[in-house]
């Protein structure tokens, strides 16, 4: 009931709480002497459902049969209407429409850790729309029954707040949840379990790793666990990997030896625990331990290449280059590289440690047979040295690879192809493809790149350190014992017309012809490999088409003679450069008048 209901009553039959689809009878009756003054026959009782008028009747009472009420709460209010006055509220009632609880499903209980508390969850089924009380009951040994009631409005979880102990780990407990409301009750199917079934251990903690004698092959993982743990599973992986290695261990007692770790690798380790071989559940994984394994001496050998440069009649410059070992080969931080240079006949040797570089340049006599050995060292030792005999890599003409070509292959790749040398192709032990940015000055400081190719290959895709719109000098070496032959070509991965033409810096007269000198186009404006230069000229103030001379591009060339100019005629000259993609805009214009006699 609502309100004070001083003037009358509202009664609801059969009950204020009804099953969905049921009919209710609502009666509103006035108390004695509470009708309209002097006009009791004029009493008009009106029944409202919320704010909507659903029935009225003249007299002291009103009966109304109501059907089709929705789930939830519906408010009915009875009011009295007298002539010439506002409606007066008499009384009201709330009717609660709902359903009996469905049987709770999927009851399951868990205790997190040996010191945790038992908590159970279940599925309530459809909403009853009524106050429904849930009671969780646990029957156990010694004829005891524990229970707890749920105070929440939507209850599908209850924590007993107390702990199951392992004093009789195989004893059976039976859980059941019962839902009760005004329209009925329903109990779940019983769920029977033992301590070992429902206790989910806490994840292991305090994980540590020890490497005996700083060796990766003598590694022990330590951790702490709850007292009853019987099984552990360990998982570990390099920090940069997505795949775990998994190990199951029984009765580990908080330690396990790991035998297959890689040196100088950061690993992530996690551990999980379980109380029984086939009962219960695994704990969550522990927090990760991250640890780096110790170094081991390097394996593998350095890939070494070299370049020789003539200095004068008695000296030559040797530049050695080598590639870093892979992480798995380095097995630690490379502290230095050891380079040993030896004259093979005299036996004189020079050793040097190189740090921070993967190249070394020295000057040696042009006479004698020279060899180098290069190895990489970390804190645990050195790699096996790579030995190379220094020879003239391009001396054997018959070993030179034939028909070398270089073609763009997608973004920032160049496909280099060749034919085996004329001399017995089976003599080739390996090919080396070398490339470096083309610098007109032949700068030896430009980084050198190379890759090795098996003797049966006749192509190589070069992609390392290849930039768009840069021209590369590419060499293919065929190596056979102490001999080598080579061929070279220019190539680029992407090209377009040069951004500018050459800058003419001087025009000089020589025996009736002229010599034009120019500055090279800056490398960053060449936009690929130059194929030709063009020199244009025409008479000043003439509208005729210019004449031109096309010169094949050569790296070192920066002058060219022209002998077809008339004496005492002023000419305008300019130059352009061409790549395979097209011609540049023209460079600066220069005027020149040949002073010599007419032919």
């Amino acid at each position: 009931k609502i309100d004070a209901c001083k003037r009358g009553d509202v009664t609801v039959k059969p009950s204020h709480v009804i099953l969905l689809g049921s009919t209710v009878n609502i009666t509103c009756s006035l108390k004695p002497r509470q009708g309209c003054f002097h006009y009791s026959r004029r009493n008009k009782l009106i029944l409202y459902k919320f704010d909507r008028r659903i029935n009225f009747h003249h007299g002291h009472s009103l009966n109304s049969q109501v059907t089709g009420l929705p789930l939830g709460t519906t408010l009915f209010v009875c009011k009295l209407a007298c002539i010439n006055s506002d409606e007066i509220q008499i009384c009201g009632a709330e009717i609660f429409v709902g359903v009996a609880p469905e049987q709770p499903q999927n009851l399951s209980c868990i205790q997190k850790g040996e010191q945790g508390t038992v908590a159970c969850t279940w599925e309530r089924g459809r909403d009853t729309h009524l106050y429904t009380e849930y009671t969780l009951q646990l029957s156990g040994p010694k004829n005891l029954t524990w229970q707890k009631q749920c105070k929440d409005i939507y209850c599908d979880y209850l924590d007993f707040g107390i702990n199951l102990t392992p004093e009789s780990p195989e004893s059976n407990f039976t859980a059941k949840v019962t839902a009760v409301n005004s329209l009925g009750s329903s109990s779940s199917l019983p769920s029977t379990f033992t301590f070992l079934d429902i206790v989910r251990p806490l994840p292991p903690w305090d994980i540590r790793i020890k490497f005996q004698k700083a060796s990766v092959s003598r590694c022990t993982l330590y951790w702490r666990d709850e007292g009853l743990v019987l099984l552990n599973r360990l998982r570990y992986r390099p920090s940069n990997s997505r795949l775990w290695n998994m190990v199951n261990v029984t009765k580990a007692k908080g330690r396990h030896d790991l035998l297959d770790l890689k040196p100088f690798t950061e690993y992530e380790f996690q551990i999980s625990s379980k109380l029984h071989l086939y009962k219960g559940s695994w704990s969550d994984w522990s927090e990760s331990l991250r640890a780096q394994t110790p170094e081991e001496e390097p394996t593998g050998m350095l890939d070494v290449w070299y370049m020789k440069r003539h200095i004068d009649y008695s000296r030559q410059q040797i530049s050695l280059f080598w590639k870093n070992l892979s992480v798995s080969e380095a097995r630690g931080k490379i502290l230095h590289y050891q380079v040993t240079l030896q004259e093979l006949t005299g036996g004189k040797a020079m050793t040097q440690n190189i740090t921070g570089h993967t190249s070394w340049t020295t000057v040696i006599p042009r006479t004698g047979n020279w060899a180098v050995a290069v190895s990489a060292a970390n804190s645990k030792g050195s790699s096996l040295p790579t030995r190379i005999n220094i020879m003239n890599l391009c001396e054997a003409g018959l070993l030179a690879p034939r028909q070398v070509s270089a073609n763009s292959e997608g973004m920032d790749n160049i496909l280099v192809t060749w034919q085996p040398p004329r001399k017995d192709p089976s003599a080739v032990q390996e090919y080396v493809v070398e490339w470096r940015e083309l610098h007109p000055g032949g700068d030896t400081q430009v980084p050198l790149n190379w890759l090795r190719s098996r003797p049966y290959n006749v192509s190589a895709l070069i992609s390392e350190n290849i930039k768009s719109y840069i021209c590369y000098e590419i060499r293919v070496y065929a190596l056979s014992g102490d001999q080598g032959g080579c061929s070279s070509i220019l190539g680029n991965s992407k090209h377009k017309a040069p951004l500018s033409g050459p800058h003419i810096n001087a025009i000089t007269e020589e025996k009736g012809s002229i010599l034009i000198s120019w500055n090279s186009i800056p490398v960053q404006e060449q936009m690929g490999c130059l194929l030709h230069y063009r020199i244009y000229w025409k008479e000043r103030d003439s509208n005729s088409q210019p004449q031109l001379c096309e010169i094949p591009y050569r790296v070192s060339q920066n002058s060219h003679p022209i002998n077809s100019l008339q004496p005492r005629v002023t000419y305008v000259l300019w130059m352009t450069a061409l790549t395979a993609a097209g011609e540049s805009s023209h460079g600066n214009e220069r005027e020149f008048c040949l002073q010599g006699k007419a032919n």
Partner: nanobody, 125 residues
Framework: QVQLQESGGGSVQAGGSLRLSCAVS????????MGWFRQAPGKEREFVAA???????VYPNSMKGRITISRDNAKNAVYLQLNALKPEDTAVYYC???????????????????WGQGTQVTVSS
Amino acid sequence: QVQLQESGGGSVQAGGSLRLSCAVSGRTVSDYAMGWFRQAPGKEREFVAAMSSSETTVYPNSMKGRITISRDNAKNAVYLQLNALKPEDTAVYYCSMGPIATFQGLARQNEYHYWGQGTQVTVSS
């Protein structure tokens, strides 16, 4: 100083009801497990009912449905409602209190640290 004082005992006809009270001073009932035990003449003390600090209750199956333990935190008291009494329910009823957090411990005498003096319940046929 912790004190537990039982009251509400007395003589009652078989089939009758009693409500025993246990008033606690020196400790807060909601922080502890509260138990009721009874001892009949010439017999060992036996477990009747208990309520943990988390409001989980426990009863022996033999008495379930006839007894209810409850707690009033505001009054710092615990109650035991006894219904459908039988002559074999005749005993001294003791209120007890202890920091118990295990299922099995709630029904064990030795887990309770504090005890009242007891109140006599006599059921005649």
